[in-house]
Interface confidence: low
């Protein structure tokens, strides 16, 4: 009687585009064939997948967020066959370039400014807002009531993923009109994908440089 196999992993929380993952079908058994399934389908050909040790070891050479699985392995001999319980990888990734919504760049004086920032990331990233280079708050949503022309400026959302050690940012130039009609969206919006606060500041400088020369 074959034992029920199980999958061991050298890394259950791999980082996207950085880590390789080795999945091993246990136990070692004589005169046994090893099989693998991903997402309930037979393993399909991919240059990032590598089978070794008589198909007992499956290596994902460079994981992506689509490689979560589930993975199952099976063992068979001439008399019986057994399949493992599924194993899911927790692939850490991101944060992707954030998106600030709504996309509006121009507001009337006296309106409320309610900006939301979102970035695809696992685990969820830490969010920070900077206005004209000054850190304001660590929240996903930035709310300012009854804005005035004093609230003109570069609004940067900064996202950080402690698991991947990566961060990212985007900057939007918001203009507040004091007149009755809102101006057209003439303010420039620049987005930057960077690795730290310096990138936000640099993007913010570019924003202001363009804004003041138009």
């Amino acid at each position: 009687e074959l034992p029920k196999p199980y999958i061991s992993s050298n890394n259950s929380n791999p980082i996207e585009d950085k880590d390789a993952v080795t999945l091993t079908c246990e136990p070692v058994a004589e005169n046994t064939t090893y099989l693998w399934w991903v997402n309930n389908q037979s393993l399909s050909v991919s240059p990032r997948l590598q089978l070794s040790n008589g198909n007992r070891i499956l290596t994902l050479l460079s994981v992506t967020r689509n490689d979560t699985g589930p993975y199952e392995c099976g063992i068979q001999n001439s008399e019986s066959a057994k399949r493992s319980d599924p194993v899911t990888l927790n692939v850490t990734y991101g944060p992707d370039t954030p998106i600030i919504s709504p996309p509006d760049l121009s507001y009337r004086s006296g309106a409320n400014l309610n900006l939301s920032c979102h970035s695809d990331s696992n685990p969820s990233p830490q969010y920070s807002w900077l206005i004209n280079g000054t850190l304001r708050q660590h929240t996903q949503v930035l709310f300012i009531s009854k804005i005035t022309s004093n609230n003109n400026g570069a609004y940067a959302c900064f996202v950080s993923n402690l698991a991947t050690g990566r961060n990212n940012s985007i900057v939007k130039n918001i203009s507040v009109s004091s007149g009755d009609s809102a101006p057209g969206s003439s303010g420039l919006s620049a987005s930057g994908s960077g690795s730290g606060l310096n990138d936000i500041f640099e993007a913010q400088k570019i924003e202001w440089h363009h804004h003041h020369h138009h």
């Epitope: 099989l35 309930n40 037979s42």
Partner: antibody, heavy 120, light 107 residues
Framework: ELQLVESGGVLVKPGGSLKLSCAAS????????MSWVRQTPEKRLEWVTY????????YYPDTVKGRFTISRDNARNTLYLQMSSLKSEDTAIYYC?????????????WGQGTLVTVSA | DIQMTQSPASLSASVGETVTITCRAS??????LAWYQQKQGKSPQLLVY???TLTEGVPSRFSGSGSGTQFSLKINSLQPEDFGSYYC?????????FGSGTKLEIK
């Protein structure tokens, strides 16, 4: 004794429809992934479609996708193949097969086949 | 799709001889290869799977070998019941594809 018995093969006109059945006995049908495989008059073997043991996963090659539908009734130990928009190139002996081990397994058990002829 | 190229298309041999049939996959299929035997008027029968594992009841004069893209089926000391057609097939996920077959005839 494990048995797979196909039925339903007849002469049909191009564009017509047909439903094949495969009655399984002598094994735990509901535990096996199943496929239909056909053999052309030129003796070439072609995989036609696959269904997993529970019936929730099906696969088709491009040659039959959208025209053929595989299904199963585990309570009745029966596999089905609904064929529509039949073409002359679908003429073949159709075999009901059981996979040896899940979707990665080869075709371990074969029925005797049923002949489908598509001709005007 | 993975293409399976089988050779030779036909083969004549005498009882007692040793013959080898080869199969080449267009892509790496590791060891996910099966061999089938089909006698005139009968259904195919699985001989070998995972490139070299013999199905229960298959005589030891049959042996499969190879991995990756190159595979072979060897029959030692041919017996009268071994004559018929042989097909290779990959079982490395769908779509499953077969070789075009090798007809083994008595010389």
């Amino acid at each position: 004794e494990l048995q797979l018995v196909e039925s339903g093969g007849v002469l049909v006109k191009p564009g017509g429809s047909l439903k094949l059945s495969c009655a399984a006995s002598g094994f735990a049908f509901s535990s096996y992934d199943m496929s239909w495989v056909r053999q052309t008059p030129e003796k070439r073997l072609e995989w036609v479609t696959y269904i997993n043991s529970g019936g929730g996963i099906t696969y088709y090659p491009d040659t039959v996708k959208g025209r053929f539908t595989i299904s199963r009734d585990n309570a009745r130990n029966t596999l089905y193949l609904q064929m529509s928009s039949l073409k002359s190139e679908d003429t073949a002996i159709y075999y009901c097969t059981a996979h040896y081990f899940g979707s990665s397994g080869p075709f371990a058990y074969w029925g005797q086949g049923t002949l489908v002829t598509v001709s005007a | 799709d993975i293409q399976m190229t089988q050779s030779p298309a036909s083969l004549s041999a005498s009882v007692g001889e040793t013959v080898t049939i080869t199969c080449r996959a267009s892509e790496n299929i590791y060891s996910y290869l099966a061999w089938y035997q089909q006698k005139q008027g009968k259904s195919p029968q699985l001989l070998v799977y995972n490139a070299k594992t013999l199905t229960e009841g298959v005589p030891s004069r049959f042996s499969g070998s190879g991995s990756g893209t190159q595979f072979s089926l060897k029959i030692n000391s041919l017996q009268p019941e071994d004559f018929g057609s042989y097909y290779c097939q990959h079982h490395y996920g769908t779509p499953f594809t077969f070789g075009s077959g090798t007809k083994l005839e008595i010389k």
